[in-house]
Structure formats: structure tokens, C-alpha cells
Interface confidence: low
């Protein structure tokens, strides 16, 4: 008798298959978020109708930081637990006593590097078929670290400034909120804020912009703050000096013109009076007192400490000439000053913006209120300047001496050494 295959055989096989236990891993919540350092529980449960004698569970992770390198987290096989990758040693375990149908695990002291996709793979022979893998995403969150606050740009009135705020750490990426710590907690009306970048741009800052500003960095699990003190700077006296100097310079130019006319007038009048007198040499003088020691060194212009610190530059031997004329008044203001005799005046250019210059190859540093005085001797015996052992001695001269301030053209015409005259403000700072 030949055996004949029943047409019901496939159905019988199916029914037998149905009798065999079918393992099924339950749906997981999809993803879990946990703050760094806190424990995480990764769920995985399954159903089976077979005994748990041959239960085999492997937890694997595909780290977000290295998706090409899956790692074993923990293993249960043959009734024993085995650790996975070394970085999980001592931090991972099953939440319940094994064997069990709840094969969830905990991870203690979670680290940023634990972020990734975790898979539990469950086998429980003789179970066959069904879904034997559960997948859970783990994201380790990091609160914002203390942010850094800083100011970019000039804090002068009318300037634009940017307040910057950034945290080195924070997952998810923090947002940044700036506020002014006054009664309103509102930023100035000219401020625009970028909460993603952590910047506030304040345009055209005024005194009202001054004050304490706070940046709050925040994300899903925490906040952190930093403070910044914005002090808007008012115009400096230095700037006021420049404005005053500009006005003064205008006045000075007018006075200078008058002085030139007067100077020319006196010059020509005296010249016409004494035509018969022979011409005598001219000296370039400085209306300053002699220093205690005047050594003749290689050409060097010094800043002396007399009232008006006049400066005279001569040629290579640093000879100095001093005016003994008591009629030359020491005046540090930006005005022309006339002597009581009407025959002597000194002029000080107050705020001309003259840079340091080079004369005779030497760098001249501008001094304080330099005055150039040309003295024309009218007596028959001019003062004799003698120089011995490097010092300059002075011999008396007749009393008939007139001091004039002469124009540059006139100086050149009479053969005087041309000198640029640097000037400074009264306080001694350059202008």
C-alpha cells in the first residue's frame, strides 16, 4: 500500500506551528531621555509560552558618536550574566532577577557617549518565529554649562555694542535670553536679540543703556546664567579739549595776523629811524631760564620745566640762547601779550596739532607751549656768547633790546635757522 500525502498536511503543519511557542518582544516606547549622570532604564519585555531554560539575551548599542561600531552592552546566556564593552563595566545590569520575561536593563551614571540606539535580542529555544528584537533610543541630556558673557565693540556713547553669551556644553543646544536687570527686565529699545546665537545688538548706545545685563542659557533640563556690566562712556575731557582747541585755533589765527601787522609796523618804523646804523647779527633766542647745567652734547632737544617750556632748535652743537629781557612776558595762554612798552610781545600757539618732527636728523619730541623769539640787538655791542668746555656762558649786553615775533618768511629772509614749533595742551598731553 502506497502512502498517500493528505491534502490536509499543510494545514496540519500550520496547526503544529501554532502549538509551538512564538516569542514576541513588546513594543518599546521608542526613545528615552535622561540627564547626564542619572540612571536610565531601557525597557524590553517579551512573551513566550516556553520555559526560560535556554533564554539568551544580548543588548547591543549603536552609539550616536560612532555608528559604524556597534558594541555589546550586556549578555545573558546559559544562566550567566556577562558584561559588554568595557565602558559599560560596573554601570549596567538587568533590572530584575534573571531569567525573566522582563529583560530591561539599567545604565547607571549615564555619559554623553551612552547616547545611541539600543537593541535587545531575545532567543528562547524552542521558540521560533515572531519578533525577537526590541529597539530603544537613548539620549543623554546635558544642562547648559555656565555661559561666558562678553561685550564686543566700543562702549562710547553713540556706538553699537554686541553682548555675547555662549555655553560650552548643553544638549539639547541651549537657547539664550538676555535681560537688563532693572525694574522692567526689558532690553533698551534699540536692542535686537538672537536667542539661538546668544547675541544682543544694542545700537546707538546712550547713558540709559548702562547697567547690569543677565544672560540665561536654558534647555530641556536646566538653566545657567552669567552677568555683564555695561558702562557707557561719556565724552572724555580730552575730546572737549579738541573742540575747544579748534575754536581757540581760529581765534589764534586772527590774533596772529594782527600780531604780524603790528610786528611789521614796529620793524619798519625802527628800521627807518636808524638807517645809518650798521647791521648787526641776529640771534635766535628762547624765552626760558637757563638750566642749572647746560652741557653741549650731540644735538638733542630737551623738555625743560620752566613756566612756558619754550623750545629752540639750533644746528649741530646744541648752543642755547636765552633772552634776558625782562620785558618778554611768560604767558602760557593762547593769546598775544603785549609789554607795557609796546615794543615786545610773545605769542603762544595753544592747540596746533603738530606731530613730532625731525630736525638735523634728530627726532624732536613736542614739548609744552614752545615759543620762538627772535631778538634783534639795537645796541652797538651785542651780547657775546662764549663757549668753553662744553658750557655756554652769558655776558651782559646793553639794555636796548627789542623782542619781536617774526613771520616764517621774514626769518628765512634774514638767515635764521627754520624750526618747527611743536605744541601741547596745558596738561602736557599732546594735541
Amino acid at each position: 500500500m502506497t502512502s498517500q500525502r493528505s491534502p490536509l498536511a499543510p494545514l496540519l503543519l500550520l496547526s503544529l506551528h501554532g502549538v509551538a511557542a512564538s516569542l514576541e518582544v513588546s513594543e518599546s516606547p521608542g526613545s528615552i531621555q535622561v540627564a547626564r549622570g542619572q540612571p536610565a532604564v531601557l525597557p524590553c519585555t517579551f512573551t513566550t509560552s516556553a520555559a526560560l531554560i535556554n533564554l539568551n539575551v544580548i543588548w547591543m548599542v549603536t552609539p550616536l558618536s560612532n555608528a559604524n561600531q556597534p558594541e555589546q552592552v550586556i549578555l545573558y546566556q546559559g544562566g550567566q550574566m556577562f558584561d559588554g564593552a568595557p565602558r559599560f563595566h560596573g554601570r549596567v545590569g538587568f533590572t530584575g532577577t534573571m531569567p525573566a520575561t522582563n529583560v530591561s536593563i539599567f545604565i547607571n551614571n549615564t555619559q554623553l557617549s551612552d547616547t545611541g540606539t539600543y537593541q535587545c535580542l531575545v532567543n528562547n529555544l524552542p521558540d521560533i518565529g515572531g519578533r525577537n528584537i526590541g529597539v530603544t533610543g537613548l539620549t543623554v541630556l546635558v544642562p547648559p554649562s555656565a555661559p561666558h558673557c562678553q561685550i564686543q565693540g566700543s562702549q562710547d556713547i553713540g556706538s553699537d555694542v554686541i553682548l555675547l553669551c555662549s555655553s560650552e556644553e548643553g544638549i539639547p543646544r541651549p537657547t539664550y535670553l538676555w535681560e537688563k536687570l532693572d525694574n522692567t527686565l526689558k532690553l533698551p529699545p534699540t536692542a535686537t536679540q538672537d536667542q539661538v546665537q546668544g547675541t544682543v545688538t544694542i545700537r546707538n548706545i546712550s547713558a540709559l543703556s548702562s547697567g547690569l545685563y543677565q544672560c540665561v542659557a536654558s534647555n530641556a533640563i536646566g538653566t545657567s546664567t552669567c552677568l555683564l556690566d555695561l558702562q557707557v562712556i561719556s565724552p572724555q575731557p580730552r575730546n572737549i579739549g579738541l573742540i575747544a582747541g579748534a575754536i581757540g585755533t581760529g581765534a589764534v589765527i586772527i590774533i596772529f595776523c594782527i600780531a604780524l601787522i603790528l610786528g611789521a609796523f614796529f620793524y619798519w618804523r625802527s628800521k627807518n629811524k636808524e638807517e645809518e646804523e650798521e647791521e648787526i647779527p641776529n640771534e635766535i633766542r628762547e624765552d626760558d631760564l637757563p638750566p642749572k647745567c647746560s652741557s653741549a652734547k650731540a644735538f638733542h632737544t630737551e623738555i625743560s620745566s620752566s613756566d612756558n617750556n619754550t623750545l629752540t632748535s639750533s644746528n649741530a652743537y646744541n648752543s642755547r640762547y636765552w633772552s634776558n629781557n625782562p620785558k618778554v612776558h611768560r604767558n602760557t595762554e593762547s593769546v598775544s601779550h603785549f609789554s607795557d612798552l609796546g615794543q615786545s610781545f610773545s605769542f603762544h600757539s595753544g592747540n596746533a596739532n603738530i606731530p613730532s618732527i625731525y630736525a638735523n636728523g634728530t627726532h624732536l619730541v613736542p614739548g609744552q607751549h614752545k615759543t620762538l623769539v627772535v631778538t634783534a640787538n639795537r645796541g652797538s655791542s651785542p651780547q657775546v656768547m662764549s663757549r668753553s668746555n662744553g658750557s655756554v656762558s652769558r655776558k651782559p649786553r646793553p639794555p636796548h633790546t627789542h623782542s619781536y615775533t617774526i613771520s616764517h618768511a621774514t626769518l628765512e629772509r634774514i638767515g635764521a635757522v627754520p624750526v618747527m614749533v611743536p605744541a601741547q595742551s596745558r596738561a602736557g598731553s599732546l594735541v
Epitope: 549578555l75 546566556q77 564593552a85 568595557p86 560596573g90 554601570r91
Partner: antibody, heavy 119, light 111 residues
């Protein structure tokens, strides 16, 4: 600086037990694990097992399972390795080594303890 | 699982470079970036020279470098010096229940 100082040499009879200590200093003991590695005379290195000083979890090499026990005393920052039922082929220098739990290498080693099993 | 495979010995002259190989499987060397190298002088404890395949601990000369290709890791020592003469061991993390495998060791001789 990190130091692991082990107990002195031991001579044991077959069947006896030995307990070797490893005192750690210069770092936070509970932040690392301790591994034990042995080296028979003229032979290579053999990993014996690992203990977490953080929570006392252990993993032992399969061939030593049941004969070895590793423990720690966090109050003294000391790790211990006990090997029972000694045999002559257990004669070796036993080293403790610090294990950063996140990388798997043995970054600092003790000076070694010679255990001689002889009848 | 058996030990990782290393050559029993290598040699080189001072100033030369040498390379020591360490061959495993995809379950150990090839599967993880947890390969370390140790130097052991006679009568001394081993010293970590390279960890995680390529990283050098502080205090170790930059003449020592590590690399990995597939299931084989390598230690290269450049500009050999007399004090480099020692036995070198590799080890690798491997999945449980073995966890740690050592190579058999390579004796480096500086000629």
C-alpha cells in the same frame, strides 16, 4: 602619582588558597576597575578577571570560574584576589592593574606577587 | 577563544624602525577599537605603551605608534634604541564570556 602596591610573595601547598592584596593610591579608587593578570614563569600574560571598584561587579575568565574570587574594600582602597584549590600550574607572578572602565586597557600595574605552589 | 597571534621575536638595529603584528578575529581585534600594547622588561611589571589602537599615554615616547587594519593590529617603533629591547604584548577586548585576550608576546632584540 598613581600607585598599586601588592602584598609579598607566597608559597602554598597544592589544594590550599592564596589571597593577594593590591592597595591603590593617587586616584579615586571607585572611579576605576581592577583587573588581575598572571604570568607563569617564562610564559605570557593571562587575564584572570575584573572587578568594578564602583559597585563590586565581577567578571572572571572562564577557566578560573569557581576557583577565583575578587573583592574590594573601598574604605582602604584595596583590591583582593583569592584563588582556591591551588595547583602547581598556578605558580605565577600575579599582577593587579588599574582598568579605566571606559577603555579596557590596563594603565597602571602593581609590582607583582610571586605565588609558588609546591608540595 | 585562543590567544591573539604575535610573532615570537623581531629584531632591528639602533635607528631602524620595526613593526610587531597582532592578529585576531572579527570578534576581538577587528570588532572593537580596544587594542592595547604593553612593554615588559625582565623582572618588571608590564607598562602600557598604546591604548585604543592608536593612543599613547603621557610619558610614552612618540617613537611608539599603533594602527589597525581589519583583524590585525600593529605596533611600530621608530628610531630603535637599546632600551626598547623587551617583550611586547598586545591585548584586545572581546565579547563575553572571555572579555580580554592577550597575545603570546614578541621578544624585541636591538642588535
Amino acid at each position: 602619582q598613581v600607585q598599586l602596591v601588592q602584598s609579598g610573595a607566597e608559597v602554598k601547598k597544592p589544594g590550599a588558597s592564596v589571597k593577594v592584596s593590591c592597595k591603590a593610591s593617587g586616584y579615586t579608587f571607585t572611579s576605576y576597575g581592577i583587573s588581575w593578570v598572571r604570568q607563569a614563569p617564562g610564559q605570557g600574560l593571562e587575564w584572570m578577571g575584573w572587578i568594578s571598584a564602583y559597585n563590586g561587579n565581577t567578571n572572571y575568565a572562564q577557566k578560573l570560574q569557581g576557583r577565583v574570587t575578587m573583592t574590594t574594600d573601598t574604605s582602604t582602597s584595596t583590591a583582593y584576589m583569592e584563588l582556591r584549590s591551588l595547583r602547581s600550574d598556578d605558580t605565577a607572578v600575579y599582577y593587579c592593574a588599574r582598568v579605566p572602565a571606559w577603555s579596557g586597557q590596563f594603565d597602571y600595574w602593581g609590582q607583582g606577587t610571586l605565588v609558588t605552589v609546591s608540595s | 577563544q585562543s590567544a591573539l597571534t604575535q610573532p615570537a621575536s623581531v629584531s632591528g638595529s639602533p635607528g631602524q624602525s620595526i613593526t610587531i603584528s597582532c592578529t585576531g578575529t572579527s570578534s576581538d581585534v577587528g570588532g572593537y577599537n580596544y587594542v592595547s600594547w604593553y612593554q615588559q622588561h625582565p623582572g618588571k611589571a608590564p607598562k602600557l605603551m598604546i591604548y585604543e589602537v592608536t593612543n599613547r599615554p603621557s610619558g610614552v615616547s612618540d617613537r611608539f605608534s599603533g594602527s589597525k587594519s581589519a583583524n590585525t593590529a600593529s605596533l611600530t617603533i621608530s628610531e630603535l634604541q637599546a632600551e626598547d629591547e623587551a617583550v611586547y604584548y598586545c591585548n584586545s577586548y572581546t565579547s563575553g564570556p572571555t572579555y580580554v585576550l592577550f597575545g603570546g608576546g614578541t621578544q624585541l632584540t636591538v642588535l
